[in-house]
């Protein structure tokens, strides 16, 4: 990959192994766990990142596992099945043959079942709401400055097209970032909102996926923006199918 420079590293994904074994001896970076070659000029898919995270040997781990109190998607970390495009397979199963259906960001959207469970299609998550609470500051941030800084972050760091950042809401100390991306809107080469949200989530937790870059240093007009809580909500193009038992629990 040309994006992986002469020193043969992957700037956008530290969970890779890079080697000059590509065509013509060019640098090629493969995701840990899956072995799939990744494009180092853009974000790696969340599925491949999760698989890499679960496969990295303890002694070689470069990323910190979240503490027991960390908020994680639904059922937390699991070793996913990814398709040859690097997307989540619609049906995920664990080692004990318990299966469930997931959406395009890998979050469970049905009750758990057995191997007979069918997941006909990978349902797209088209709306992501990132809910942040920042640490106390002397005063509230200016809303338009905050809006501009977060939009810049998603555009420059995560390479997400600005049109997919639908809105930034702010009521001190809560910040909400809305990402929207329908199937019809996503063109070839566009970063997926699910991938951008995952990179952002890991950045916020101090577990940056970028190679060699410093951690995320968010500042609004020079004032540090320190996040103390993150919740991420996912809305799918087709509503999830959970039993009433779960809904009333």
């Amino acid at each position: 990959h040309t994006a992986a420079q002469d020193n043969c590293t992957c700037p956008t994904n530290k969970m890779t192994v890079c080697s000059p074994d590509g065509p013509g001896g060019r640098c090629q970076c493969r995701a840990l766990g899956s072995g799939m070659a990744v494009d180092c000029s853009t974000l790696t898919s969340k599925c491949l990142l999760l698989k890499a995270r679960m496969s990295a040997p303890k002694n070689a781990r470069t990323l910190v596992r979240p503490s027991e109190h960390a908020l994680v998607d639904n059922d937390g970390l699991y070793d996913p099945d990814c398709d040859p495009e690097g997307r989540f397979k619609a049906r995920q199963c664990n080692q004990t043959s318990v299966c469930w259906c997931v959406n395009s960001v890998g979050v469970r959207r049905t009750d758990k079942g057995d191997l007979s469970l069918r997941c006909d299609e990978l349902v797209r998550t088209h709306h992501i709401l990132i809910d942040l609470r920042h640490r106390p500051t002397a005063g509230a941030f200016n809303h338009s400055d905050l809006d501009a800084e977060l939009r810049r972050l998603f555009r420059e760091r995560y390479r997400l097209h600005p049109k997919f950042v639908a809105a930034v809401h702010y009521e001190q100390p809560t910040i909400q970032i809305e990402l929207r991306q329908n199937t019809s809107q996503k063109a070839a080469g566009d970063v997926d909102i699910g991938d951008a949200a995952y990179y952002f989530e890991r950045d916020i937790k101090g577990e940056s996926l970028f190679q060699g870059r410093g951690g995320l240093d968010l500042r609004v007009r020079g004032e540090p923006l320190q996040v103390e809580r993150t919740l991420i909500y996912y809305l799918d193009e087709i509503p999830p199918k959970f039993s009433m038992k779960r809904l009333t629990a």
Epitope: C8, V17, D21, S34, A37, G86
Partner: antibody, heavy 116, light 113 residues
């Protein structure tokens, strides 16, 4: 030039273990994936797993997990593939190979025979 | 796992004639990030290790005669020997190195008619 030289043939009894070596030369050992492939008599090729010696990352084919252990010694540019709890079905030629899009480099193969 | 299926299992072709071996994968081997097909073709003669002929579905390894060519994309691939020579008698394998575990086709035995 790139060369992978494997250890000689082995005859083992059922239940024993065997360790096959693969000495690499002619390239930077730590910069390339090195894989192991099995070929039972008259059969096809099966990928067993690989190792990236530079960072000791290892991948195993599920089929061989618990049966095979892949290691590498960077000081001698040598990779190893150990088979445990040998059975007659493990009788095969085992190849090491440098992996990659255009890495057509294979060891000569090591015949492991399991017989009582 | 990706399943690689070759056809035919065996093939007899006259010297100087064209030989065609097909390989079908159960999942696409095209990497959308770099538009590379992660498929290789190997030739194996008795008592020898496999020899790489083609990588990336269609790129000939250096030193391989130009009568060998590879084509195809996604899930369907073909190895063609344009004019069979006596030294081409061997077993031919396709291999996916797109995603772990890497898998091989069952092999095609090529003989002279």
């Amino acid at each position: 030039q790139v060369q992978l030289v494997q250890s000689g043939p082995e005859v083992k009894k059922p239940g024993a273990s065997v360790k096959v070596s693969c000495k690499a030369s002619g390239y930077t050992f730590t910069e390339y994936w090195l894989g192991w492939v099995r070929q039972a008599p008259g059969q096809g090729l099966e990928w067993m797993g690989n190792i990236f010696p530079g960072s000791a990352y290892i991948n195993y084919n599920e089929k061989f997990k618990g049966k095979v252990t892949i290691t590498a010694d960077t000081s001698t540019s040598t990779a190893y593939m150990e088979l445990s709890s040998l059975r007659s079905e493990d009788t095969a030629v085992y190849f090491c190979a440098r992996e990659g899009s255009n890495s057509g480099y294979w060891g000569q193969g090591t015949l492991v025979t399991v017989s009582s | 796992d990706i399943v690689m299926t070759q056809s035919p299992d065996s093939l007899a072709v006259s010297l100087g004639e064209r030989a065609t071996i097909n390989c079908k994968s159960s999942q696409s081997l095209l990497n959308s990030g770099n538009q590379q097909n992660y498929l290789a073709w190997y030739q194996q003669k008795p008592g020898q290790p496999p020899k790489l002929l083609i990588y990336g579905a269609s790129t000939r390894e250096s030193g391989v005669p130009d009568r060998f060519s590879g084509s195809g994309s996604g899930t369907d691939f073909t190895l063609t020997i344009s004019s069979l020579q006596a030294e081409d008698v061997a077993v031919y394998y396709c291999q996916s190195d797109h995603i772990y575990p890497y898998t091989f086709g069952q092999g095609t035995k090529l003989e002279i008619k």
